[in-house]
Interface confidence: low
């Protein structure tokens, strides 16, 4: 279920998957949220701890069960991730900053009025994803009103650091907010060139589309076919960025699929979930369970509702089912994607659907912090 | 709102305004949106006025004057008053719509959570309210969503400030106490929210007020987690299933 | 002591002009829905024409729609019916009468005036 | 719009007397419905509204009940104040009154 209640005071020992630095609890809630494997995480603010470089650290963290032991560490922040909470699953994080720097590739630098009109510039710009701005009081003249439009490798800043007149922020793409406009086209027998951040496996282009637009870096995509030459690159999904934010050339080549992140969409945003069943295909991954159900729907509700199985094969091959019941194998990977698709079998898969902002789950639980 | 600013698209995604369809329309209430197939509101909004054909429901918008025919809006299924509530007095002012279709999330258009029942525990530093109500007494409804960060007052201290009604402990009240910041006319039935662990929350509906915004005169909502069994009940379908978001 | 005190009734002309006043005291005038209600010479009550609190909204029966026209001034705690293109048969006691919309609230007409006679007659 | 018919048009009672006015709307209104007494020459007098809640400082001897389209004003023990015209009022979809029932002296 969805638990969002955070823990003040307490930090949770063990289980990293990943560590990175973020302005606040929330903030690193969601990155939580998003991570394929993390189920709870632990936040330090700046006042918690003396270490410089683990003051704004957000750990995140898996656990076979579910929790973790959790440790006394006083000004720490720990919580869960928001998967399974409905519509409360958001990219989307308003929050201004005062008095914090958000460090990363300054690659724009301008003169801004407010920070409001920074973090503007910022959503209307394809490569930021934070900024900073130094107010009409920043201690050197040279540097007041400011606006510094930021990248880093990961999405989040390499660094935070505490300043006075300083205010930073993220960008509200993942808001819907972005001025730029989307490509909604999908390019038929074209592949993108330009830099390959990173390389999943799909089994289309519409779930290659949706991992690219909420991936930090993906600017653009190219999707190999299950019909494409190379059986090594079969159901390749590959995902892109260049300087420019655009392909700077693309390629004719059959049985392949290129488009655009959806990310500077206005108005709507895909949902950070797959909801389509795919006949015939097996996902390969990690077990994590096996369980008898009537029906390929109640494998995939099975599936999101067990936190950690981020997709499903349901069998239809006759030494796995018992009279209406057939297997349903619950599976995981390291990035939340197959690590083997196959096609011609007996069954059927998908994606669970913890991600899924629609749910009627009930998202709104609260319990007493323990202070 | 009085003494507010003009709100951002999807900062308030739960926001909705009730407007009515007669020769002309208008904006009457605000109302917040908790499920897919539910609107909460103020049961005033519909004094007079109770038919459901009249009304339509606009969300995930900002601007009032971006309202055209062609804009898509809710239409109301059921209109539920709290069974107690009087037109004669302040009391239980509360009321659900359900709509005729269930509508979608997105970044615009999503519900607010609703306290635990008799939260009475949590003390909430960081709230707001919005609405496209007037902006002075003798005002008009305003275009853009406004938004007011107010506190919360205590109920003994709002008592002794409205000695000719009884402020009763399924109300919630708040301002400054020199005014200047408050809901009004046309914010009726909109949510009163509270940040609390980065979490919001709908605490009240905007409900009631001596004037907008005067000194030492509080606005009055209606206390949600008072209203948590009801709202339960009412929302419960037939599968047993609550279509909106409250707690487990 | 709340009261509702309405003018400005007479006799007049078909198709002549007449102005209705209703005067409010003892209440927060705009906190609440006005309304006019007609009685003719030994018949019923007819609902007539009725305005919201801020008097944005205003509506009307259908025998009077294009006819009549409510209004109200706040800040003078004042109704108004200007009645025009008057007919024989709008001949009655209007009376002007008061639901609350603010603090505390009523479904029904709370407060009426005594009433005011107009008579269209040639 | 909505159409109210109330029944009887008159009723002679005398004091003591159980006296039920019927009223009838064209479609359902909900409860939004009230009632009114009115004596000769004054403004009418709010006794009930949303069907059944007595308006305060209304004797107890009134009540109504009622919902949808079938509505009754009851008052079970006739006095002699309560002699009058006894109107019903939807507050549905604008307003519109019933043609009134006039309680008189047997």
């Known amino acids: 279920g969805c638990l969002t209640q955070l823990y003040e005071n307490a930090f949770f020992r063990g289980g990293d998957v990943a560590s990175m630095y973020t302005p606040n609890a929330q903030y690193c809630q969601m990155r939580c949220t998003f991570h394929p494997r993390c189920l709870l995480f632990s936040f330090l603010p700046a006042s918690s701890i003396n270490d410089m470089e683990k003051r704004f650290g957000c750990f995140l963290k898996d656990s076979v069960t579910g929790t973790l032991p959790k440790v006394h560490r006083t000004g720490a922040v720990s919580g869960h991730s928001l998967k399974q909470c409905g519509h409360q699953i958001s990219a989307c994080h308003r929050d201004i900053y005062k008095g914090v720097d958000m460090r990363g590739v300054n690659f724009n630098v301008s003169k801004v009025s407010s920070v409001e009109e920074c973090q503007k510039r910022c959503t209307s710009n394809i490569r930021c994803q934070f900024f900073s701005y130094a107010t009409q009081t920043f201690h050197k003249a040279e540097y007041r009103n400011n606006c510094l439009l930021k990248y880093s490798p990961g999405g989040t800043p390499t660094a935070i650091k505490v300043l006075s007149n300083v205010e930073s922020g993220f960008s509200l793409k993942p808001c819907a907010l972005s001025e730029i406009g989307c490509h909604m086209n999908i390019f038929q027998h074209l592949a993108f060139s330009d830099v390959d951040v990173a390389r999943v496996l799909t089994p289309d282009a519409f779930v290659c589309r949706t991992i690219c637009t909420y991936h930090p870096n993906c600017l653009f995509f190219t999707f190999y076919t299950n019909v494409w030459k190379i059986e090594s690159q079969r159901n390749v999904c590959l995902l892109k960025t260049s300087e420019s934010g655009t392909p700077s050339s693309s390629t004719p080549q059959e049985n392949t699929i290129s488009g655009y992140s959806l990310l500077t969409c206005k108005r709507t945003l895909p949902e950070p979930c797959h909801s389509k069943i795919y006949p015939g295909v097996d996902f390969g991954g990690e077990e994590l369970n096996v369980t008898f159900v009537k029906g390929v729907n109640v494998c995939q509700e099975t599936c999101t509702k067990m936190i950690r199985c981020q997709f499903f094969t349901y069998s239809l091959l006759p030494e796995d089912c018992k009279e209406e019941k057939c297997k349903c194998f619950l599976r995981l990977s390291m990035d939340g994607s197959p690590t083997r698709i196959a096609y011609g079998t007996q069954g059927s898969s998908g994606y669970s659907l913890r991600l899924c902002n629609t749910g009627d789950n009930s998202v709104c639980t609260t319990k007493t912090s323990t202070r | 709102i009085v003494g507010g600013t003009n709100s951002s698209w999807g900062e308030w995604p739960w926001q909705v305004s009730l407007q009515v369809k007669l020769t002309a329309q208008r904006h009457l209430c605000g109302g917040s949106l908790i499920g897919h197939q539910w609107v909460l509101t103020a049961a005033h909004c519909f004094d007079g006025l109770p038919l459901q054909d009249v009304w339509r429901i606009y969300s995930g918008i900002l601007n009032l004057s971006d309202i055209t025919k062609d804009t898509p809006f809710s239409q109301i299924k059921e209109i539920i008053i709290h069974q107690n509530y009087k037109v004669s007095e302040g009391n239980h002012d509360i009321a659900l719509i359900k709509l005729q279709a269930p509508l979608n999330y997105t970044e615009f258009q999503k519900p607010i959570c609703l306290p635990s029942k008799g939260d009475t525990s949590t003390i909430y530093t960081n709230c707001w309210v919005t609405g496209w109500g007037f902006s002075k007494e003798k005002g008009e409804i305003q275009n853009i969503l406004q938004k007011v960060n107010i506190p919360l007052v205590t109920n003994e201290e709002c008592q002794k400030r409205y000695q000719d009604y009884k402020i009763t402990q399924r109300m919630v009240c708040a301002g400054y106490k020199e005014g200047g910041k408050d809901a009004c006319k046309g914010d009726s039935g909109g949510p009163l929210v509270c940040k609390h662990n980065g979490m919001w929350r709908l605490v009240g509906i905007t409900s009631w007020g001596e004037g907008c915004a005067r000194r030492e005169q509080p606005g009055v909502y209606t206390k949600v987690a008072e209203y948590m069994d009801w709202i339960l009940e009412k929302t419960q379908s037939s599968d047993g299933k609550a279509q909106m978001q409250s707690p487990a | 002591e709340v009261q509702l005190l309405e003018s400005g009734g007479g006799l007049v002309q078909p198709g002549g002009s007449l102005r209705l006043s209703c005067a409010a005291s003892?209440?927060?005038?705009?906190?609440?829905?006005m309304m006019w209600v007609r009685q003719a010479p030994g018949k019923g009550l007819e609902w007539v024409s009725g305005?919201?609190?801020?008097?944005?909204?205003?509506v009307y029966a259908d025998s009077v729609k294009g006819r009549f026209t409510i209004s109200r001034d706040n800040s003078k705690n004042t109704l108004y019916l200007q009645m025009n293109s008057l007919r024989a048969e709008d001949t009655a006691v209007y009376y002007c009468a008061y639901r609350r919309t603010g603090i505390p609230r009523r479904d029904a007409f709370e407060i009426w005036g005594q009433g005011t006679m107009v008579t269209v007659s040639s | 719009d909505i159409q109210m018919t109330q029944s009887p048009s008159t009723l002679s009672a005398s004091v003591g007397d159980r006296v039920t006015i019927t009223c009838r709307a064209s479609?359902?209104?909900?409860?939004?419905l009230a009632w009114y007494q009115q004596k000769p020459g004054k403004a009418p007098n709010l006794l009930i509204y949303?069907?059944?809640t007595l308006e305060s400082g209304v004797p107890s001897r009134f009540s109504g009940s009622g919902s949808g389209t079938e509505f009754t004003l009851t008052i079970s023990s006739l006095q002699p104040d309560d002699f009058a015209t006894y109107y019903c009022q939807q507050y549905n979809t604008y307003w519109t009154f019933g043609q009134g029932t006039k309680v008189e002296i047997k």
């Open positions: 003892g209440f927060t005038f705009s906190h609440y829905i």
């Open positions: 305005i919201y609190s801020s008097g944005g909204i205003t």
């Open positions: 949303k069907a059944s």
């Open positions: 479609q359902s209104i909900s409860s939004w």
